[in-house]
């Protein structure tokens, strides 16, 4: 692969890496956050950063409970400079082909360029094209939501079914759930899994006369999506007198393969496309977000884009010391590579954000789950945290036990909106939620020593069981309210955190070769499942499983 963006092969070659190694040994591994607060009355002041969104709303990022001090932060920033994170960032924002293994630009940031400033890829200003897609989405979503767009019997659309997988599903699912408060006109459903149950259960609850299907597949060849789409089409035709002319009113495509879209029976006027510089896991900002625009309305969708654009502006214009996503990424590297942390917990204290960790899981793990650098050599360091999470307070009653008292260091992000969309019972629920948000981060930091445990009456062998070591790092993210703009900003924050990690590890965060092998083998095995012969072409385990399956199927 051609890589002209970085001049180092491995992050371990960088002087700041060795410096951080020494700092970790001399102070990092014994650093006590509790003591750091005692030493420095201005620690919170210095280590919290407030992001102001385009609409004036704010998000506070509190990094002060992390295992860092001034010297560590300075060394991490030095590492970012040596790794030329800003150079790679600027190359991305200039539309250069930073996805070196696929020789593509990485330009999802151009999708939220609502300032309409010129943004170039290969000499083409793509801003007018992006704007044109959004105009098409606006017109279409407003027609459907207003009832002007009618189904084949003249009834207005009541339900939208998005059929897609991976980036064509996770983003829209997460965002529609997160912004449910802004919906009201349409119901939206998502079908992703090839398991027939997913489409079957969805088709049970929708009416063919009032349902619009969105087939989301860039190439219109994704096996799972096209299989589900054909099942939906066959169901639709079987319920509507087998008249293919009705398809045009009930199916739209989020794709770039005009030929296949037309072959399927979809009117190409109802085809919403995006360019090759949009990666799947970065595509919710594109036409793939049509289900979002239909659900919450185009104006809210645009606010979502503008929230992300505001973070883009912050990321590109803010000095490193105050650059919020950059600091988030640097902390991740600090824990991953110097503390040996292998996971990253994201716990939203917000039920609307219940799919946010799943979305971030793809964003982070598909981007940075790589072991070869841009210099085409295997890394000699850990990359790609295992990201997981569930909404709190539920999570407190499941895996938080391990976070508090387990043997692993689990850097955690806690997310809360100060204002609830549902301030019921005189805000009782919200206050309880918030008290847990604050308490969990505090408890993880301060812990509980043997003295306190004994003072509380515990004796003998029970004492060590009740001890909390504390000093477990958290970043608290406090938003004013989960609005479309806030959500856009939060996603963009994590995109740029992921970018920063990948830039320092010198990996290509924008390909996904790891998804290919399984797909190829599944095609081979798929053919073997079509006949009744005993299979012996694989290893003994795979043969045994296939043959047992065929016997039982």
């Amino acid at each position: 692969s051609n890589n002209s963006f970085t001049n180092f092969k491995l992050a371990t070659e960088l002087p700041a890496w060795s410096k951080l190694q020494k700092i970790y040994e001399s102070q990092g591994k014994t650093l006590s956050v509790k003591q750091e607060f005692q030493k420095d009355a201005k620690r919170f002041e210095k280590l919290n950063k407030t992001f102001t969104n385009y609409d004036g709303s704010k998000i506070l990022f509190d990094y002060s409970k992390n295992l860092v001090n001034d010297e560590i932060i300075a060394a991490l920033i030095e590492l970012a400079k040596e790794a030329n994170v800003t150079g790679l960032r600027d190359a991305m924002f200039k539309g250069e082909h930073i996805n070196s293994t696929e020789d593509r630009a990485v330009y999802h940031v151009a999708l939220r360029n609502r300032a309409n400033k010129p943004m170039y890829v290969d000499g083409v200003n793509v801003a007018p094209e992006v704007d044109s897609v959004l105009k098409h989405m606006k017109e279409f979503s407003e027609q459907v939501r207003s009832g002007e767009w009618k189904g084949y019997t003249g009834k207005k659309i009541t339900d939208v079914v998005n059929i897609g997988i991976g980036g064509s599903d996770l983003g829209p699912v997460m965002v529609t759930e997160a912004l449910k408060h802004y919906a009201g006109v349409l119901d939206v459903h998502f079908v992703s899994n090839i398991d027939g149950t997913h489409i079957a259960e969805t088709l049970k609850v929708v009416d063919p006369e009032t349902t619009l299907f969105l087939i989301a597949s860039k190439t219109f060849t994704t096996a799972e999506t096209i299989t589900n789409a054909n099942t939906a089409k066959n169901w639709f035709l079987s319920k509507t007198g087998n008249d293919p002319s009705h398809i045009a009113k009930h199916f739209a495509a989020l794709s770039t393969n005009e030929t296949e879209v037309a072959k399927f029976g979809i009117d190409t006027k109802n085809m919403f496309g995006f360019e090759s510089w949009v990666g799947g896991r970065y595509s919710v900002w594109s036409a793939i977000g049509l289900s979002v625009a239909l659900y919450i309305g185009y104006d809210n969708f645009e606010a979502f884009l503008k929230g992300a654009e505001a973070v883009d502006n912050h990321f590109t214009q803010t000095p490193l010391e105050d650059n919020i996503p950059l600091l988030g990424g640097l902390l991740s590297v600090w824990y991953n590579n110097f503390f040996g942390a292998q996971t990253h917990l994201v716990a939203p204290f917000d039920q609307y954000l219940h799919r946010f960790p799943a979305y971030l899981q793809q964003l982070s793990m598909e981007s940075n789950g790589k072991s070869v650098t841009r210099g085409n050599v295997f890394t000699d360091y850990s990359t790609g945290s295992i990201l997981f999470g569930e909404p709190a307070t539920n999570a407190q009653h499941s895996f938080f036990q391990l976070v508090h008292q387990g043997t692993k260091l689990i850097p955690s992000d806690f997310i809360l909106a100060a204002q609830s969309h549902n301030p019921i019972e005189n805000k009782l629920h919200q206050k309880m939620l918030a008290s847990n948000f604050f308490a969990q981060a505090e408890a993880l930091m301060v812990g509980k020593d043997e003295e306190q445990v004994k003072a509380e009456g515990a004796t003998g062998g029970l004492v060590p069981h009740k001890v909390f070591s504390g000093n477990r790092p958290t970043t608290s993210i406090l938003a004013q309210k989960i609005t479309p703009a806030t959500l856009g900003a939060l996603i963009a924050y994590y995109e740029h955190v992921t970018f920063t990690e990948g830039a320092i590890w010198n990996i290509n965060s924008f390909d996904q070769w790891g998804v290919e092998l399984g797909k190829v083998l599944a095609k081979v095995i798929g053919k073997e499942l079509d006949n009744s012969s005993t299979i012996s072409t694989h290893d003994a385990s795979t043969n045994g499983l296939i043959n047992q399956f065929k016997e039982w199927m």
């Epitope: 890829v121 000499g123 083409v124 200003n125 793509v126 007018p128 094209e129 704007d131 044109s132 897609v133 959004l134 105009k135 098409h136 017109e139 770039t256 393969n257 005009e258 030929t259 037309a262 190409t268 085809m271 919403f272 496309g273 995006f274 360019e275 036409a287």
Partner: nanobody, 117 residues
């Protein structure tokens, strides 16, 4: 900035052939449907031929079988091969690009085709 530059027009005798070219720059060419329109003096501009981003073609009834539209995505070019020309084909021929995913279009300046003996 966006440019569509037509070439290949000129004077040709009835029954003759011409090949028009349109060089596009400043657009994501492969994502555009490209077309040729023409306008004869005192008449409305009319579609002659169109090729979608996927390569499907459409022709005006009056030119079907005589004209062929093609595209070269690697070089951002669209062609109109015109055979068996007659005086009815005399017009200014305009190159047109229509973005496949939204309401965005561009026009060239036009090239004159005159069929006369």
């Amino acid at each position: 900035q966006v440019q569509l530059v037509e070439s290949g027009g000129g004077l040709v005798q009835p029954g003759g052939s011409l090949r028009l070219s349109c060089a596009a720059s400043g657009i994501t060419f492969s994502s555009y449907a490209m077309g040729w329109y023409r306008q004869a003096p005192g008449k409305e501009r009319e579609l002659v031929a169109r090729i979608t981003s996927g390569g499907s073609t459409d022709y005006a009834v009056s030119v079907k079988g005589r004209f062929t539209i093609s595209r070269d995505n690697a070089n951002n070019l669209v062609y109109l091969q015109m055979n068996s020309l007659n005086s009815e084909d005399t017009a200014v021929y305009y190159c047109h690009s229509q973005y496949s995913y939204g309401p965005l279009e561009y026009w060239g300046q036009g090239t004159q085709v005159t069929v006369s003996s």
